[in-house]
């Protein structure tokens, strides 16, 4: 028997509380693939992070760094301070 949840498109989740019908992702959440039983919470770009792309019903928010900082890690998981003019970046910092 086909799983009824497989019919739920990205941007929705299969709602067990409503007889496995597809429901829109709740506020501040998304699902990037179909057949999901929950939606994922949107990433918040706060502090030294700034929003490069808003969260949608089907894709997470993307962050970059505020001026004076640059991204490090997959998906800009960290922001590191830029070196001042005349300084160079080493493993220990500027």
């Amino acid at each position: 028997l086909q799983d009824p949840c497989s019919n739920c498109p990205a941007g929705t989740f299969c709602d067990n509380n409503r007889n496995q019908i597809c429901s829109p992702c709740p506020p501040n959440s998304f699902s990037s693939a179909g057949g999901q039983r929950t939606c994922d919470i949107c990433r918040q770009c706060k502090g030294v992070f700034r929003t490069r792309k808003e969260c949608s019903s089907t894709s997470n928010a993307e962050c970059d760094c505020t001026p004076g900082f640059h991204c490090l890690g997959a998906g800009c998981s960290m922001c590191e301070q830029d070196c001042k003019q005349g300084q160079e970046l080493t493993k220990k910092g500027c």
């Epitope: 498109p9 709602d15 409503r18 429901s23 829109p24 709740p26 506020p27 949608s56 019903s57």
Partner: antibody
């Protein structure tokens, strides 16, 4: 009886902020989302955003990102919509509407609307 | 983010049937069965007439029906009556960060 009662009309100067309230009664406040929709004079409906009164999570229309803030007070079953940096184009009737049911694709009950006029 | 496309006006005589279209894309109307229709009389708040493409809330006349084909949703009003004269708006869930989108509205005139 389900009711959404909104605050009264407001007149604001450009650059100011406005905070519209929407008091819910007749249902379990935290079980239903609240949408905010506006309508400029003689124009169509425009979706602004949605709030989950249970946890307070929000999603805003791209057009209003950075200018709109939706909050709620569960003790009084009231949702608030604050719009900042007002301009003349923000002159409109602002409606709150209950999402029906919990993760709903529609709004079954609407407030009476709050007229916000932005004028210098 | 542009609105869903509706005809500006549709008219019909009492007793006739009329259909209002609402055209979007595969990212909204075509991608989801979360299409609603609202009726709005002048100076009043909108009223939900159809939700989830074709479901009718209790209290809404059976003369109102909804359907969808591809990227276009439709609202049909059969047995047109004078009180049906109003503005009608479609609304759809979308994949964009603007999660819900309205059509531009259709003014229905009963001749």
């Amino acid at each position: 009886e389900v009711q959404l009662v909104q605050s009264g009309a407001e007149v604001k100067k450009p650059g100011a902020s406005v905070k519209v309230s929407c008091k819910a009664s007749g249902y379990t406040f935290t079980s239903y989302y609240t949408h905010w929709v506006r309508q400029a004079p003689g124009q169509g409906l425009e979706w602004m955003g949605i709030i989950n009164p249970s946890g307070g999570s929000t999603s805003y229309a791209q057009k209003f990102q950075g200018r709109v803030t939706m909050t709620r007070d569960t003790s009084t079953s009231t949702v608030y919509m604050e719009l900042s940096s007002l301009r003349s184009e923000d002159t409109a009737v602002y409606y709150c509407a209950r999402g029906a049911p919990e993760y709903s694709s529609s709004s079954d009950y609407w407030g009476q609307g709050t007229m916000v006029t932005v004028s210098s | 983010q542009s609105a869903l496309t509706q005809p500006a006006s549709v008219s019909g005589s009492p007793g006739q049937s009329i259909t209002i279209s609402c055209t979007g894309t595969s990212s909204d109307v075509g991608g989801y069965n979360f299409v609603s229709w609202y009726q709005q009389h002048p100076g009043k708040a909108p009223k939900l007439m159809i939700y989830d493409v074709s479901k009718r809330p209790s209290g809404v006349s059976t003369r109102f029906s909804g359907s969808k084909s591809g990227n276009t949703a439709s609202l049909t009003i059969s047995g047109l009556q004078a009180e049906d004269e109003a503005d009608y708006y479609c609304n759809s869930y979308t994949t964009s960060s603007t999660r819900w989108m309205f059509g531009g509205g259709t003014k229905v005139t009963v001749l």
